[in-house]
């Protein structure tokens, strides 16, 4: 057969679908690849052709679009499970065609297994809510398209395994579920099973967000530094190992890119002949805050090291934070045996 | 320092209905989640409601849901709670609180009483 | 909601004693626990947050611990100023709630 623009296979969409549940794929060409959308591609007398290969399998093959209760369907872009089998699973192409034109693209779609309480393979969408915010509203995702406007489906909210009825501050409302006052009790797994009439059958559709309770905007603040500190003296005698901690506390704040580094004597240790190790650990609170420690060693210290300027630096969206550490060299008394023997005019 | 002054208590009949205002100071008051706590005569403490910073969230206890309503203007640094069909068991000193999630009630007023009886 | 509960009822110790307070949740509340002092006629305030740290300008006497569903409130050797009704709030899930109270009075 003639050439055909092929995408390969799109591995960005990682299509998860649950078990007995009807799913709706569009096909990617029209999203991701192609300038112009279905309608236009179908009245220039293009045609979308379906295929796929069977998990563990290399044969192309057709989809059954016979299969008892139109199992397998398409319209327009959008190729229909009503509802997914476990051996759904496979890689799925869509080809747009005709005598002069060809483009395709694959994607992987795994059908997922869940249990009673709804744990599963399957990747969730995380939601941040702030903490103590008034109201945060999650919405039951990725159910547009499967019933039309005049079905009013039923919804039932789950954190879990337990229904949220009589939750004080989490209210279920339809399609959305309400949040007053969050607080990181509210962390969890929250699970919306829509449930829809269609040609005399029910169907199904389960949908997880998974919330985190984060710290909020109000609370934000430039990194604070707690080491070094003017508190503390880092003195060695040359020979010894030197450990300078460099410890910066970050509130959470969305999307902020938290830095922290060194410089020695305004240089990157990088850039300085000396021998330096550095170490980094992060820890989060329980509302994503995060200290960053940076530990700064060199193994054997010279009297040139312990006269250098060691400055801890740190950076957010919120500003920047330096401080210096006090490092000086230990003064070692005389000993006093030989102090004694000087004194007596001993040779 | 912070400040919070509880004014509004008094005597009420059964039914009828006071406005509890809390005046607060010292504090970037727009920043933090306020509560009423009350506390009957010889009793323990109860939480009766809280707002969150923006105003926008309220929660309240199942006793006064309905009834109470808790407000505020962070314009005026105030705290609101207006209270209506009161019964005999509200009768209290109610207090405002300022809270944290990561520090609890951490300041109170003083207290004003509501005295429910006919 | 959450029931806090308190025990015992009623502490009765001498000045310069030890005492120790518990407070029990019937789920776990994490370290989202608070301990208050009320002195009569006065207003609560806040010993002890996150069930062990101490709030600003309160004595090094007064000590929590615990984390989970079991908390304690030491109070390492009682000064006169110390007699008072003491009770733990958890934070932890709405409702607010709060235990009955110790009341800890002069042996």
């Known amino acids: 057969s003639e050439r055909c623009d092929d995408w390969g296979l799109d591995t960005m969409r990682q299509i998860q679908v649950f078990e007995d549940e009807p799913a709706r794929i569009k096909c990617p060409l029209f999203e991701h690849f192609l300038k112009y959308n279905y309608s236009t591609a179908h009245s220039s007398g293009l045609t979308l052709i379906w295929y796929w290969t069977r998990q563990d399998r290399d044969l192309e093959e057709p989809i059954n679009f016979r299969l008892p209760e139109n199992r397998i369907s398409k319209e327009k872009d959008v190729l229909w499970f009503r509802p997914t089998l476990l051996n759904d699973t496979g890689n799925y192409t869509c080809m747009l065609r005709n005598t002069t034109y060809c483009s395709k693209v694959a994607f992987p779609l795994e059908v997922v297994q869940k249990d009673s309480c709804f744990n599963s393979a399957m990747r969730f969408p995380v939601h941040k809510m702030y903490i103590e915010h008034g109201i945060h509203k999650i919405t039951c995702p990725n159910v547009d398209g499967y019933f039309p406007s005049s079905v009013k489906p039923s919804v039932t909210w789950y954190k879990g395994c337990t229904e949220i009825v009589d939750f004080h501050n989490v209210l279920p409302e339809g399609m959305n579920l309400s949040f007053f006052i969050p607080l990181v009790s509210n962390n969890g797994n929250y699970t919306c099973v829509v449930t829809y009439p269609e040609n005399g059958r029910l169907f199904h559709l389960t949908r997880t967000v998974t919330v985190k309770v984060v710290g909020s905007p109000k609370d934000a603040l430039p990194p604070q530094i707690y080491s070094p500190n003017d508190r503390v003296v880092y003195e060695k005698e040359p020979g010894e190992e030197l450990v300078i901690p460099c410890k910066v506390y970050f509130s959470f704040i969305m999307d902020s890119h938290n830095e922290v580094w060194w410089t020695i004597d305004g240089k990157k240790p990088d850039d300085v002949t000396v021998d330096i190790t550095i170490n980094e650990s992060v820890s989060y609170s329980s509302t994503e805050d995060e200290t960053r420690t940076q530990i700064l060693s060199i193994k054997k210290v010279t009297p040139e090291d312990l006269r250098r300027n060691y400055v801890c630096h740190a950076r957010n969206t919120k500003g920047e934070a330096e401080q210096a550490a006090k490092v000086k060299q230990k003064v070692i008394p005389p000993r006093y045996t030989v102090e004694l023997a000087c004194g007596f005019g001993a040779t | 320092e912070v400040q919070l002054l509880e004014s509004g208590g008094g005597l009420v009949q059964p039914g009828g209905s006071l406005r509890l205002s809390c005046a607060a100071s010292g504090f970037i008051f727009s920043h933090y989640g306020m509560s009423w706590v009350r506390q009957a005569p010889g009793k323990g403490l109860e939480w009766v409601s809280a707002i969150s910073y923006d105003g926008e969230g309220t929660l309240y206890a199942d006793s006064v849901k309905g009834r109470f309503t808790i407000s505020r203007d962070n314009s005026k640094n105030t705290l609101y709670l207006q209270m209506n069909s009161l019964r005999a068991e509200d009768t209290a000193v109610y207090y405002c609180?300022?809270?944290?999630?990561?520090?609890?009630?951490?300041?109170w007023g003083q207290g004003t009483l509501v005295t429910v009886s006919s | 909601e959450i029931v806090m509960t308190q025990s015992p009822a009623t502490l009765s110790v001498s000045p310069g004693e030890r005492a120790t307070l518990s407070c029990r949740a019937s789920q776990s509340v994490s370290s989202n626990l608070a301990w208050y002092q009320q002195k009569p006629g006065q207003a609560p305030r806040l010993l002890i947050y996150g069930a062990s740290t101490r709030a600003t300008g309160i004595p090094a006497r007064f000590s929590g611990s615990g984390s989970g569903t079991e908390f304690t409130l030491t109070i390492s050797s009682l000064q006169s100023e110390d007699f008072a009704v003491y009770y733990c709030q958890q934070y932890n899930n709405w409702p607010w709630t709060f235990g009955q109270g110790t009341k800890v009075e002069i042996k």
């Open positions: 609180a300022r809270f944290r999630y990561y520090t609890a009630f951490d300041y």
